[in-house]
């Protein structure tokens, strides 16, 4: 990536890291308003299976692993990217390495959920306070989950699907910060590990993933009022280990693995028409990216 100053524009979709033949250090940003990609400052250490989020206008890259010809190291790292300076800086590491992690943000705090360290599949969850640069463990999930999808809705943290070390999962659970407890919610219709999970219009969407046999293109959404999962239109491509985010009322899915190919495809879902469309391609195919959108 280039080390020049990034243009000071809002509402970019950032994609960090990923995997193609080895873990990647790319940071790139897509501008949906004009369809352009920006090449930004590389991660200091390549990583895949990471998660991305934005707090206070800063982009955070959380966990993952560096799978390279020199070895394979799971990451406990938290790194912060400032779009105004186009620079990364390290923050306090998590208590344990977490590859194929999920993250969510509540009240400016980052929740790191599940993931793996070697063959240990975590059910542990920890919360980061940016003002203090500190991590603290909170209540563990009821289920060990890697490749878990995480989303926040109405100040509740949802952990969806994943892999517990033996089985891919259709189960989902919800964390109540005030009570510091997890409760199971209605299971998805489909087993999904490595799905893309996000929130749009008061629903939690789970897109794609892997069911233990095949990559999926199906998409379902959870209505918190009715506590039911309902299928919506499928994506054009089957994909697991995809990136996902929401931008101006639409869902964007980025890359992933279809069982044969590392996808460069970026699809966009319009809930008004219940349709997916191909909107752009990443500069190269990859899986296991961390994705987030800058705030206004």
């Amino acid at each position: 990536g280039s080390m020049g100053h990034a243009p000071k524009v809002g509402r970019l979709i950032y994609t960090a890291g990923g995997y193609f033949r080895q873990s990647l250090s790319y940071l790139e940003a897509y501008n949906p308003s004009d369809g352009t990609w920006l090449d930004l400052a590389d991660l200091q250490v390549p990583r895949s299976g990471l998660a991305g989020c934005v707090v206070g206008g800063l982009l955070y890259a959380v966990g993952g692993r560096n799978n390279s010809p020199d070895g394979n190291t799971d990451s406990s790292a938290l790194d912060c990217y400032n779009p105004m300076t186009n620079q990364w800086s390290p923050c306090a590491p998590m208590s344990v390495p977490r590859n194929r992690i999920g993250v969510g943000v509540i009240d400016g705090h980052i929740y790191a959920v599940g993931g793996s360290h070697g063959c240990i599949h975590h059910n542990s969850v920890e919360r980061y306070e940016p003002e203090r640069d500190e991590w603290h463990l909170v209540a563990p999930m009821l289920t060990r989950r890697i490749g878990v999808g995480v989303a926040v809705l109405n100040r509740l943290l949802y952990a969806v699907g994943g892999f517990d070390g033996t089985n891919r999962l259709n189960s989902a659970e919800c964390y109540y910060p005030e009570r510091n407890e997890w409760r199971m919610i209605t299971a998805m219709n489909t087993i999904r590990s490595g799905a893309g999970v996000c929130v749009l219009h008061n629903c939690i969407y789970a897109a794609g993933g892997y069911d233990g046999q095949d990559q999926l293109n199906s998409v379902e959404r959870y209505d918190v009022e009715t506590e039911t999962w309902t299928f919506v239109a499928p994506m054009k491509h089957r994909r697991s280990a995809l990136g996902i985010t929401v931008h101006q009322g639409r869902i964007y899915v980025l890359g992933g693995y279809d069982g044969h190919t590392f996808l460069d495809s970026v699809e966009c879902y319009d809930p008004d028409t219940d349709t997916w469309s191909e909107v752009t391609r990443m500069t190269s195919g990859r899986s296991g990216v961390g994705v987030a959108v800058t705030m206004e």
């Epitope: 995997y19 033949r21 895949s48 299976g49 799978n67 070895g71 394979n72 194929r100 793996s116 070697g118 063959c119 240990i120 599949h121 490749g147 892999f163 070390g165 033996t166 089985n167 590990s193 490595g194 892997y210 233990g212 046999q213 095949d214 990559q215 697991s240 280990a241 693995y257 069982g259 590392f262 899986s287 296991g288």
Partner: antibody, heavy 121, light 107 residues
Framework: EVQLVESGGGLVQPGGSLRLSCAAS????????IHWVRQAPGKGLEWVAS????????LYAKSVAGRFTISADTSKNTAYLQMNSLRAEDTAVYYC??????????????WGQGTLVTVSS | DIQMTQSPSSLSASVGDRVTITCRAS??????VAWYQQKPGKAPKLLIY???SLYSGVPSRFSGSRSGTDFTLTISSLQPEDFATYYC?????????FGQGTKVEIK
């Protein structure tokens, strides 16, 4: 019945290349992580490479990293090991094996019969 | 890399004997250890996974146990078909590593 059948071994000169195939039947390779393990003549077992069916990520032993490439074609239900820049010390019987869960607690429950690779001038 | 030190490298035993093979990991590997049996010219066969779980179809005379970083394969009453080489394997951390093998021969 679950079966793995390797092919593609043979005699090759140092610096040469070979592509090994592992044809699976009785199960879908898309549902398993596939591993290659080798055994030099009269020696023990050495893990070589693996591919994860969910993420597509591959792992390699340091001794082969940068020279060997593992891949899978789910439409043919076959895994491959492309071996380049071969050395005398790569001489071994190469086995493919499946692991039904991709975590470390699972083990390799089915193995192929092996294919012999000899690197010699 | 985690080293799996297997002992003995070979042993002689008679049919009906109780045989114990040990593998010591150079660091913690939890219970992520498997045991395999290999006969000359053949592929390895899985006996034990997760340190102590007997794989389907394997005779109950085979058992595995763990004590810290020490792992043991026991054959309670050796049968003629058990004369072979046995390997332990750790899959706790990358890269997966095998013990050097124990050859069980007829006394």
């Amino acid at each position: 019945e679950v079966q793995l059948v390797e092919s593609g071994g043979g005699l090759v000169q140092p610096g040469g290349s070979l592509r090994l195939s592992c044809a699976a039947s009785g199960f879908a390779i898309s549902a398993s992580s596939i591993h290659w393990v080798r055994q030099a003549p009269g020696k023990g077992l050495e893990w070589v490479a693996s591919i994860d069916p969910e993420t597509g990520e591959t792992l390699y032993a340091k001794s082969v990293a940068g020279r060997f490439t593992i891949s899978a074609d789910t439409s043919k239900n076959t895994a491959y090991l492309q071996m380049n820049s071969l050395r005398a010390e790569d001489t071994a019987v190469y086995y493919c094996a499946r692991r039904t869960a991709s975590d470390g607690r699972a083990a390799m429950d089915y193995w192929g019969q092996g294919t012999l690779v000899t690197v010699s001038s | 890399d985690i080293q799996m030190t297997q002992s003995p490298s070979s042993l002689s035993a008679s049919v009906g004997d109780r045989v114990t093979i040990t593998c010591r990991a150079s660091q913690s590997v939890s219970s992520a250890v498997a045991w395999y049996q290999q006969k000359p010219g053949k592929a390895p066969k899985l006996l034990i996974y997760s340190a102590s779980s007997l794989y389907s179809g394997v005779p109950s005379r085979f058992s595995g146990s763990r004590s810290g970083t020490d792992f043991t394969l026991t054959i309670s009453s050796l049968q003629p078909e058990d004369f072979a080489t046995y390997y332990c394997q750790q899959s706790y951390s990358f890269p997966s590593t095998f013990g050097q093998g124990t050859k069980v021969e007829i006394k």
